[in-house]
Structures are given as C-alpha cells and as structure tokens.
C-alpha cells in the first residue's frame, strides 16, 4: 500500500513499501520477488505501439 501523502506512481511503476519509492515494473521480469511486483500485476504496463503488417 502506498504511503500516505505520496503522489501516485506513474504508469508502468508501482509503490515499494520496502524502498519507500515508486519502482519500475519492468524490473519484475528479472526479480519477481520484489514487494512492488504485486502492484505491477494489477496495473497495466506502460503503453507501447502495436506494429501492424
């Protein structure tokens, strides 16, 4: 849960109670045990462009 009074994390990041800051969800691929990764599973990833044929 995000600490009171802090701004919400930007898209593609999630709050880490262990570090008291927003962390990039991309790092959860390498280290899924991190506490903030649970929040990443609930949030959509950062937007990316679909490349159509």
């Amino acid at each position: 849960e995000q600490a009171p009074g802090t701004a919400p994390c930007s898209r593609g990041s999630s709050w880490s109670a262990d570090l008291d800051k927003c962390m990039d969800c991309a790092s959860c691929r390498a280290r899924p045990h991190s506490d903030f990764c649970q929040g990443c599973a609930a949030a959509p990833p950062a937007p990316f462009r679909l490349l159509w044929p």
Partner: antibody, heavy 120, light 108 residues
C-alpha cells in the same frame, strides 16, 4: 566520511533482553534502507533483519522472528535492534549495514560490530 | 530459501598468484550477486556488486563474473593485504538475503 557505530552489546543470560544501537554519521540517513547482520564466533555471516528508509516495512530471518524488533529514528540518525528471549545461539558479533542508494542490492558501509554473548 | 555455496572453503596462495573463488546459487539469481572481504576482527567490506561492478576505491586486481547460478571472484595478482575471508551474497530475493559460507585465503 560515512560511519556506522554499533553499541549496546554485552553479556546477557538466556531469556534476557538487549537493545543494540547503530549511530550513523557522514551521510543523510533517512533515504537508506538498513540491515542487521550477525556473525557467530568462527562462523559466517547471517542476515538478521531489514528496515525500509521510513521504518514502515520490516523483515526478519526465521531464526529471530517474533523475538527481535528492528526500528529506526531518522531524526536521531540511529538504527535499533531490540532483542528479547535471547538464546545461546544468538551469541555473535552484530553488524549494522547501509543498503545501496537505488535498491537494496548491496551493502556498501558496515559498522565495526558489537558483541552479544548469551550465557548463564 | 536460496542457498549459496562457495568453493573452496579455504585455499593457500602466494603473493602474486592469481586466485579464483567460486560461488554457486541453488537456483538462478540472474546477476544479483555481491562479494565482500572480511579481515579478522573487522567488518565486511564490499568489493563487487551486481556480479561484476567494482565498488569505488577497490583495487582493479579484483574482478567478478558470472550470471544465473555460477559466479567467480578473481584476484589477478594476490597482494599481502588480500589475505582474508571472502563471502558471496545473493540479493535476488532482497530484502531476504543470504551469504555463502566464506572462503579463507591464507598465505602459502
């Protein structure tokens, strides 16, 4: 110069309590995660406990869970370890250490350690 | 829990020797591996972080390599001040970290 100075160790009987302190200086204490690590005589290093920069998140090794409490006072630049229900196997040198500034991947500064002896 | 196993547990070497210490994790830890040096009666000192990054102020004769489960600390030319015990530490499961049992480097 970054310094971490532990105190509070000593001889205590089994079942007794001690409170260790780790005074930080030479850096801004509040943004850094901190840990306690211990080393039994002639043995290797064992992680004991972790605390987040604000103190809102704490973690413990199974061997001390329910008996030890980690805390910090950022206004005093001090880390604490309250040790209750002490056992002979808790006898060790206890070190505090500072986590890295971007994550807690590594611990770049350590105190000199304080010896805790649990014996009757 | 992830177990870290170092080998050898001790070694004898001479000044100028190239020394290699290995650390094996019980499961993949990617590159989240640190190395520390500890001298008798002193606190551990960070040498290498994230498998291969040299901590500021550490001599360049120390180097680290590896990823996944197998890691190596190399001292290219052993100096008198390098006789100590070396520990690996995994941070893949941070803040629940674990250390290897240590490797003691002694004078031959």
């Amino acid at each position: 110069e970054v310094q971490l100075l532990e105190s509070g160790g000593g001889l205590v009987q089994p079942g007794g309590s001690l409170r260790l302190s780790c005074a930080a200086s030479g850096f801004t204490f509040s943004p850094y995660p901190m840990i306690w690590v211990r080393q039994a005589p002639g043995k290797g290093l064992e992680w004991v406990s972790y605390i987040s920069p604000s103190g809102g998140s704490t973690h413990y090794a199974d061997s001390v869970k329910g008996r030890f409490t980690i805390s910090r006072d950022n206004s005093k630049n001090t880390l604490y370890l309250q040790m209750n229900s002490l056992r002979a196997e808790d006898t060790a040198v206890y070190y505090c250490a500072r986590g890295g500034d971007t994550y807690f991947d590594y611990f770049d500064y350590w105190g000199q350690g304080t010896l805790v002896t649990v014996s009757s | 829990d992830i177990q870290m196993t170092q080998s050898p547990s001790s070694l004898s070497a001479s000044v100028g020797d190239r020394v290699t210490i290995t650390c094996r994790a019980s499961q993949s830890i990617s590159g989240y591996l640190n190395w520390y040096q500890q001298k008798p009666g002193k606190a551990p000192k960070l040498l290498i972080y994230q498998a291969s990054s040299l901590q500021s102020g550490v001599p360049s004769r120390f180097s680290g390599s590896g990823s996944g489960t197998d890691f190596t600390l190399t001292i290219s030319s052993l100096q008198p001040e390098d006789f100590a015990t070396y520990y690996c530490q995994q941070s893949y499961t941070s803040p629940f970290i674990t250390f290897g049992q240590g490797t003691k480097v002694e004078i031959k």
